[in-house]
């Protein structure tokens, strides 16, 4: 029944003070997406993207979360506390829910620059 698959940006790292895009993509299903929920590691909701009502960013994250691109989410002004798991949950008819996981590591600026310099292309 649930034929779809969720592809995510996987494990990502970003600089403290910078921004990062969290992206999930649902493929290989005829199902219709009615809502996408974005949750943080402690299960608190960051945002909901509803097919009819559009985006709702939860008050605690209003200053630092921007909707998009697409069904994704942009986290801004990153702090070390933002390190952890993020989940996208796709509500689809008639398949049900699909869930994707992203792990974000926020690095001190100097560390991020150092690790980026030595990344294998």
């Amino acid at each position: 029944m649930m034929t779809g698959t969720i592809e995510t940006t996987g494990n990502i790292s970003a600089k403290k003070g910078g921004s990062v895009i969290l992206q999930c993509h649902l493929s290989s299903t005829m199902a219709q997406v009615t809502q996408v929920n974005w949750e943080q590691h402690d299960h608190s909701l960051l945002a909901i993207r509803n097919a009819e009502l559009g985006w709702h960013i939860y008050p605690a994250f209003k200053d630092r979360v921007a909707p998009g691109p697409g069904l994704g989410l942009t986290l801004q002004s990153l702090t070390m506390n933002d390190t952890g798991e993020y989940f996208c949950t796709y509500h689809t008819y008639p398949d049900g829910t699909y869930r994707g996981r992203i792990f974000l590591e926020v690095l001190e600026s100097s560390v991020a620059e150092h690790s980026a310099r030595f990344q294998i292309p």
């Epitope: 029944m1 005829m30 199902a31 219709q32 997406v33 009615t34 809502q35 929920n37 509803n50 097919a51 009819e52 009502l53 509500h91 689809t92 008819y93 008639p94 049900g96 829910t97």
Partner: antibody, heavy 122, light 106 residues
Framework: QVQLVQSGSELKKPGASVKVSCKAS????????MNWVRQAPGQGLEWMGW????????TYAQGFTGRFVFSLDTSVSTAYLQISSLKAEDTAVYYC???????????????WGQGTLVTVSS | DIQLTQSPSFLSASVGDRVTITCRAS??????LAWYQQKPGKAPKLLIY???TLQSGVPSRFSGSGSGTEFTLTISSLQPEDFATYYC????????FGGGTKVEIK
């Protein structure tokens, strides 16, 4: 208000085709999946399948493949059911029904058309 | 396909009676169950979704319960306008309906 209005009753001869329309109003048509349900005289409800109103992709339930076609015209917020090579056993009321709710916990057919009676008789 | 079995198929009752209709699923469907009311010549009307959530505008004498494979629709005090046929529907997989329960005047 949110409603689905279907085309009127049809009397057809065996072998003919029929196209039933279902016009939506009061909501964003492409935000909610659309279903088709058949009810033969004196019988229960039978799910025929559904159409993704975003992509136009139809899915047909067992027993409703081949002669049955679901389609859309999103410019006029209308879903269509076409039945070809009609048989006497296709005589029934056909309903369109919207899937309401946004999260899976809330899914249900919350808005129905008034139904279209298709009678197949020689 | 998930089969739904409703019981009873027919039910005779009087105004003011408490009425209970059962719906059994052939496999677990969590709480993905809805109940509909249909009157002759009319389209079905949604009463309850998610097994126990009352649809907006539906009188509070209607209630639903259950999860997994066994569900019930209860009408606490039957009113004249409640004589109709009731259907359960599962939405855990491709939707299917129960066979219906006709509530008649005794």
């Amino acid at each position: 208000q949110v409603q689905l209005v279907q085309s009127g009753s049809e009397l057809k001869k065996p072998g003919a085709s029929v196209k039933v329309s279902c016009k939506a109003s009061g909501y964003t048509f492409t935000s909610y999946p659309m279903n088709w349900v058949r009810q033969a005289p004196g019988q229960g409800l039978e799910w025929m399948g559904w159409i993704n109103t975003n992509t136009g992709n139809p899915t047909y339930a067992q027993g409703f493949t081949g002669r049955f076609v679901f389609s859309l015209d999103t410019s006029v917020s209308t879903a269509y059911l076409q039945i070809s090579s009609l048989k006497a056993e296709d005589t029934a009321v056909y309903y369109c029904a919207r899937v309401g709710g946004y999260s899976v916990d809330e899914y249900a057919f919350d808005v129905w058309g008034q139904g279209t009676l298709v009678t197949v008789s020689s | 396909d998930i089969q739904l079995t409703q019981s009873p198929s027919f039910l005779s009752a009087s105004v003011g009676d408490r009425v209970t209709i059962t719906c059994r699923a052939s496999q677990g469907i969590s709480s993905y169950l809805a109940w509909y009311q249909q009157k002759p010549g009319k389209a079905p009307k949604l009463l309850i979704y998610a097994a126990s959530t009352l649809q907006s505008g539906v009188p509070s004498r209607f209630s639903g319960s259950g999860s997994g494979t066994e569900f019930t629709l209860t009408i606490s005090s039957l009113q004249p306008e409640d004589f109709a046929t009731y259907y359960c529907q599962q939405l855990s997989s491709y939707p299917t309906f129960g066979g219906g329960t006709k509530v008649e005047i005794k």
